[in-house]
């Protein structure tokens, strides 16, 4: 089942997924000047058995100049409701993202390939946030996006991670990060893809070297 | 389910300080931030400030900045919200607002500044 | 700081009715915005968030538009128990400021 919104967008922050759920899809799509071969697919397709998951079809892109010059089209087909926009930069990858049973890696770049990649996100997926350059997490709350489906319908829930700017913030002397939450977290805000932890740990680390680890942007 | 609930109705002089507490039940505290938003009477609503429950770091809008002090004690699930050198025009009351989007409120705290 | 117009500033309505609340900001916010309800003596209630995405437990009648600078509420069949102050608000950085708000009556 596709999400029917984009994952919600967080104010001076970026996300991405570590890993695609099977039954996702990557619009197969060319940089200026270049298009899809004729007969190649319209997307790549997370697919997969128990025991292993890859991408589907493979998208290749030719020459528009190449006889007909005909504009490049968006493949929308009517049933994929869901645009994830993303800008590509080199793919280095989180080391727990290949052994996730049911979930791709992210596909490696194709020849002349946009800019940007538009994913077609399906329900059970999760992504993770995180705050640009130059901003700060004031507060690290679960910083992750997860689309549900509920009474029939498909939504993603909220993160709670603030962004901000402002380096004049109350720190009170002494007071120390809790090491863990008192209470559980309920059974619906879990997930089994990367622990809330980990991630803490990756944007920790994150913040403190001032590198991204995410390999794509999201917009 | 989420509940939470703020400390009762305050009088107070003027120059005098007001400590006011939301306590949080019903999931996982430090997971949420917590907002302070004040409504004097027959007014609009007063964003004043954001507490990381987590960190306890605090950012304070900046008609408050100076006066207001927001912490927090993860051990009761309480946030706290210091407002001094009272002046009748803090006669207000005073909520407390959970995470990004404010979905769960307190029920209020009125607070009367009054000689 | 970010400024927050609504408009109206009060209106009366019939139940049955379709109302449209609107609400402008000073910049853009993209789509960090919030609408909530409030009745008199009451806590606000979060009706919608992140401009369009209905809060639960909230009523299908209700719905929200917009992004950048200009933002609407609407409340598709007006129910005797919507009366109340609306409020919209930017989350998009600090400080979080609220709209002037929006009194709805029922004729």
């Known amino acids: 089942e596709l999400c029917d919104d984009d994952p919600p967008e967080i104010p001076h922050a970026t996300f991405k997924a570590m890993a695609y759920k099977e039954g996702t899809m990557l619009n197969c799509e060319c940089k200026r000047g270049f298009r899809r071969i004729k007969s190649g697919s319209l997307y790549m397709l997370c697919t997969g058995n128990s025991s292993h998951s890859s991408w589907d079809n493979q998208c290749q892109c030719t020459s528009s100049a190449t006889r007909n010059t005909t504009k490049q089209v968006t493949p929308q087909p009517e049933e994929q409701k869901e645009r994830k926009t993303t800008e590509m930069q080199s793919p280095m990858q989180p080391v727990d993202q290949a052994s996730l049973p049911g979930h791709c890696r992210e596909p490696p770049p194709w020849e002349n390939e946009a800019t940007e990649r538009i994913y077609h996100f399906v329900v059970g997926q999760m992504v993770y946030y995180q705050c640009v350059q130059g901003y700060r997490a004031l507060h690290r709350g679960p910083a992750e996006s997860v689309c549900k489906m509920t009474h029939g319908k498909t939504r993603w829930t909220q993160p709670q991670l603030i962004c901000t700017g402002e380096m004049e913030t109350s720190q009170f002397p002494g007071e120390e990060k809790p090491q863990a939450s008192p209470e559980g977290r309920p059974e619906s805000e879990t997930s089994c893809l990367v622990t809330t932890t980990d991630f803490q740990i990756q944007t920790e680390m994150a913040a403190t070297m001032e590198t991204s680890i995410f390999t794509t942007e999201y917009q | 389910q989420v509940q939470l609930v703020q400390s009762g109705a305050e009088v107070k002089k003027p120059g005098a300080s007001v400590k006011v507490s939301c306590k949080a039940s019903?999931?996982?505290?430090?997971?949420?931030?917590m907002h302070w938003v004040r409504q004097a009477p027959g007014q609009g609503l007063e964003w004043m400030g954001v507490?990381?429950?987590?960190?306890?770091?605090?950012i304070y809008a900046q008609k408050f900045q100076g006066r207001v002090t927001m912490t927090r004690d993860t051990s009761t699930s309480t946030v706290y919200m210091e407002l001094s050198s009272l002046r009748s025009e803090d006669t207000a009351v005073y909520y407390c607002?959970?995470?990004?989007?404010?979905?769960?409120w307190g029920q209020g705290t009125t607070v009367t500044v009054s000689s | 700081d970010i400024q927050m117009t609504q408009s109206p500033s009060s209106l009366s309505a019939s139940v049955g009715d379709r109302v449209t609340i609107t609400c402008r900001a000073s910049?853009?916010?993209?789509?960090?915005l919030e609408w909530y309800q409030q009745k008199p003596g009451k806590a606000p209630k979060l009706l919608v968030y992140?401009?369009?995405t209905l809060a639960e437990g909230v009523p299908s009648r209700f719905s929200g538009s917009g992004s950048g600078t200009d933002f609407t509420l609407t409340i598709s069949s007006l129910q005797p128990e919507d009366f109340g102050t609306y409020y919209c608000?930017?989350?998009?950085?600090?400080?979080?400021?609220f709209g002037q708000g929006t009194k709805l009556e029922i004729k």
């Open positions: 607002a959970r995470g990004v989007t404010f979905d769960y």
């Open positions: 019903g999931y996982t505290f430090t997971d949420y931030a």
């Open positions: 507490i990381s429950t987590y960190s306890g770091d605090a």
């Open positions: 910049q853009d916010i993209s789509n960090y």
């Open positions: 992140n401009a369009k």
């Open positions: 608000q930017h989350h998009y950085d600090t400080p979080y400021t």
